[in-house]
């Protein structure tokens, strides 16, 4: 199923999506929409790019903050609300019969946590939870650490989101 990303109400959510322009600089249209990728295009488009620039945003909360000229079309949703929860489609509209790349990601928005941060978690969260944390400003903060993800319970996730409040981070769960 879709990879899930968890963000807290009021923070920024980061939904990764990328492609490799071939040749470099040869950009293709991309759309982001609310709802799983449909037969064509995107449902409920929130942002669209053409071969040169972002040319359609339904709200000022939707941004491509990465270098989309290099194929980073990750979506940042600023100041998320519970209504932002759901599946999003990133569709990379590569010309050709079977060439569209369709990526569905699920955003889960949770209410602000009221859990006191555990002292043991006051450390480098990226290395503590590899492949789980992404930040709204800097792209995926993912490591290539081998092995399975550590067990993370809901309390830990709430605690993590509390600690990440200032960074606008999104937690990715498998």
């Amino acid at each position: 199923s879709e990879v899930e990303y968890i963000a807290e109400v009021g923070q920024n959510a980061y939904l990764p999506c990328s492609y490799t322009p071939a040749p470099p600089g040869n950009l293709v249209p991309v759309c982001w929409g609310k709802g799983a990728c449909p037969v064509f295009d995107c449902s409920n488009v929130v942002l669209r790019t053409d071969n040169r620039d972002v040319n359609d945003r339904t709200s000022g909360r939707y941004w491509l903050k990465g270098d989309f000229h290099k194929g980073d079309v990750s979506l940042t949703i600023e100041n998320v609300t519970l209504a932002d929860s759901g599946v999003y489609c990133c569709r990379i509209q590569i010309p050709g019969i079977m060439n569209d790349e369709k990526h569905n990601v699920k955003l889960v928005v949770i209410k602000p946590a009221k859990v006191t941060p555990a002292p043991t978690l006051q450390r480098d969260l990226t290395s503590a939870f590899p492949r789980m944390l992404t930040t709204g400003e800097h792209g995926p903060a993912e490591t290539q650490t081998p092995g399975s993800l550590p067990d993370v319970n809901l309390t830990q996730i709430f605690t993590l989101t509390n600690e990440l409040r200032d960074s606008g981070a999104t937690i990715r769960t498998a």
Epitope: G35, V39, D41, I97
Partner: antibody, heavy 114, light 107 residues
């Protein structure tokens, strides 16, 4: 709500050209994707192709040499043309649109016979 | 082309009963499958897309599931208006293909 209505001849002779019209109300054909799909007597459904908001077209490769989809934005209509028809083209022809083919016409039945 | 093998081709069931239809794809279609109901003289009606997402206005008696190459569609608590022909559609790529259809008849 989007409504589609197919129209065209019910009988065409082999080797002739089939021309069908889809009239659209409730939406503009200058947005979205506008499709043709047909259903053969044995109930098999076949996707034929589309014309989209910009006028770009896509055709099922099995029909590519015979099919053409065009439009008239002033009439909000789009058209299917199928050349060199044979009895194998006897079918009910549907126009459809929407994110997942949400909206269909009721279909027009075509018989190819001499 | 991706082949969609739909089964059974027909089945009969009683009012209030439950039926399940399956579609097997010749390759992974990444959950990009839709289900339609078709009645004579009308265009097909979209019921479900992306494997399990119910179209607005469609009763929750209809459901879908699956992944990879194997997908199923169920109707529970059958009502008189449910007796029709049902089709699956894969839309993983532009070479869209439909299943061969399942005719649901009243027992």
């Amino acid at each position: 709500e989007v409504q589609l209505q197919e129209s065209g001849p019910s009988l065409v002779k082999p080797s002739q050209t089939l021309s069908l019209t889809c009239s659209v109300t409730g939406d503009s054909i200058t947005s979205g994707y506008w499709n043709w799909i047909r259903k053969f007597p044995g109930n098999k459904l076949e996707y034929m192709g589309y014309i989209n908001y910009s006028g770009s077209t896509y055709y099922n490769p099995s029909l590519k040499s015979r099919i053409s989809i065009t439009r008239d934005t002033s009439k909000n209509q789009y058209y299917l043309q199928l050349n060199s028809v044979t009895t194998e083209d006897t079918a009910t022809y549907y126009c459809a649109t929407g994110n997942h083919f949400d909206y269909w016409g009721q279909g027009t039945t075509l018989t190819v016979s001499s | 082309d991706i082949q969609m093998t739909q089964s059974p081709s027909s089945l009969s069931a009683s009012l209030g009963g439950k039926v399940t239809i399956t579609c097997k794809a010749s390759q992974d279609i990444n959950k990009y499958i839709a289900w339609y109901q078709h009645k004579p003289g009308k265009g097909p009606r979209l019921l479900i897309h992306y494997t399990s997402t119910l179209q607005p206005g469609i009763p929750s008696r209809f459901s879908g599931s699956g992944s990879g190459t194997d997908y199923s569609f169920s109707i529970s608590n059958l009502e008189p208006e449910d007796f029709a022909t049902y089709y699956c559609l894969q839309y993983d790529n532009l070479l869209f293909t439909f299943g061969s259809g399942t005719k649901l008849e009243i027992k």
